[in-house]
Interface confidence: medium
């Protein structure tokens, strides 16, 4: 009998040569096709295509990316996957939003509004307060800073909010 | 897999320091913060403080003199430093972190009996 | 600091009852964000406790819908509706909002 498989030509790239008595076979490996649709095949009339897994096979909220063969997902930012690999293949793996604001009260700096949402958050500023404009949320360095009174020129004898203003402590009041 | 791992001196005698380490896999400390809790034999579960993924802390308001937690974010390494230790300190000490919502992931444990 | 209460501290229950834990905090809760990072813990002996409830009301993934949150403000609530030999051990109810983060002191749920 004589082994058709020594031949490095038996077969296509990525497949598999089974010697047989008196004849071979070649298979596709795991994560390729046969481009002719048949399991078995012989010589080079047919090749053996990488099959795209990523059509179906990564949960949502997440990226698939495919490779020779194989696949792999990735968690969307703002979304953790279930098993801790932050690249898995595992079917039964989700990708869970994460909720920054819990997780880390200074996410958005002191006086400040953090507001979970789904993959993400937002920042914003408790009454008194604004965004700083030079900060981001983007680049991490969200910051509210304090609303100051334009003071009038003319001073109001006993007038609480005038003195304040003058002082620098006065806020824009929440109404 | 998200894993926290502590590693203690297991015996500490009165009025020395302790050092637990908290090794951590299946995720990173730049975006996650690391809590520590303790529990002695018989009572119920106490925080001791948190450094959070930006490298801050904050820490139980009856131990902020004793304590402090640093972090080699490289290692994946997260440390508890406490000194004068008493023996009511004996306790299993937890490292933990809010993976997804609330404390989700848990060490096992070490546990730190303080005596002479 | 926010003290967190709960009661009873022992509960007794036979296989199949309800079970009621309440938690009352010294103060309320909601984070500056509008959330209320009230959470429920179960610690079974030897074991490291396991996170039940988030947010006063969520169960957490993997948990028996026979777990429930309730409450708002200082006062919370976890049930059990029909309890099984698995839920025996002791909650711990736990806010995560203001620091220094505080626990409440445990519930055990015994069998009569």
């Known amino acids: 009998d004589v082994d058709e498989c020594a031949d490095p030509r038996a077969c296509p790239e990525h497949a598999t040569c089974n010697n047989t008595v008196g004849n071979y076979s070649c298979f596709c490996n795991p994560g390729f096709e046969s481009s002719s649709g048949h399991l078995s095949f012989q010589g080079l009339k047919a090749s053996c295509e990488d099959i795209d897994e990523c059509t179906e096979m990564c949960p949502i909220n997440s990226t698939c990316t495919n490779t020779p063969g194989s696949y792999f997902c990735t968690c969307h930012p703002g979304f953790a996957p279930s098993n801790g690999q932050l690249n898995f293949t595992d079917q039964g793996v989700e990708c869970r939003d994460i909720d920054e604001c819990r997780q880390d009260p200074s996410t958005c700096g002191p006086n400040s509004i953090c507001t979970n949402a789904l993959g993400s958050y937002s920042c914003g500023c408790i009454a008194g307060f604004h965004p700083n404009p030079e900060g981001s949320q983007k680049d991490g360095n969200f910051s509210c800073q304090r609303v100051l009174f334009k003071c009038k020129e003319d001073v109001i004898p006993d007038n609480k909010q005038i003195q304040q203003c003058q002082e620098g402590t006065a806020v824009k009041p929440a109404y | 897999q998200v894993q926290l791992k502590e590693s203690g001196p297991g015996l500490v005698a009165p009025s020395q320091s302790l050092s637990i380490t908290c090794t951590v896999s299946g995720f990173s400390l730049t975006n996650f913060g690391i809590h520590w809790v303790r529990q002695p034999p018989g009572k119920g579960l106490e925080w001791l403080g948190v450094i959070w993924s930006g490298g801050g802390t904050n820490y139980n308001s009856a131990l902020m003199s004793r304590l402090s937690i640093s972090k080699d974010n490289s290692k994946s390494q997260v440390f508890l430093k406490m000194n004068s230790l008493q023996t009511d300190d004996t306790a299993i000490y937890y490292c933990?972190?809010?993976?997804?919502?609330?404390?989700?992931?848990w060490g096992q444990g070490t546990t730190l009996t303080v005596s002479s | 600091d926010v003290f967190m209460t709960q009661a009873p501290l022992s509960l007794p229950v036979s296989l199949g009852d309800q079970a009621s834990i309440s938690c009352r905090s010294s103060?309320?809760?909601?984070?500056?964000?509008?959330?209320?990072?009230l959470e429920w813990y179960l610690q079974k002996p030897g074991q490291s406790p396991k996170l039940l409830i988030y947010?006063?009301?969520n169960r957490f993934s993997g948990v028996p819908d026979r777990f429930s949150g309730s409450g708002s403000g200082t006062d919370f609530t976890l049930k059990i509706s029909r309890v099984e030999a698995e839920d025996l051990g002791v909650y711990y109810c736990?806010?995560?909002?203001?620091?220094?983060?505080?626990f409440g002191a445990g519930t055990r749920l015994e069998l009569k």
């Open positions: 947010r006063v009301s």
């Open positions: 736990f806010q995560g909002s203001h620091v220094p983060l505080t």
């Open positions: 103060q309320s809760i909601v984070h500056s964000n509008g959330n209320t990072y």
């Open positions: 933990v972190s809010i993976y997804y919502r609330g404390f989700d992931s």
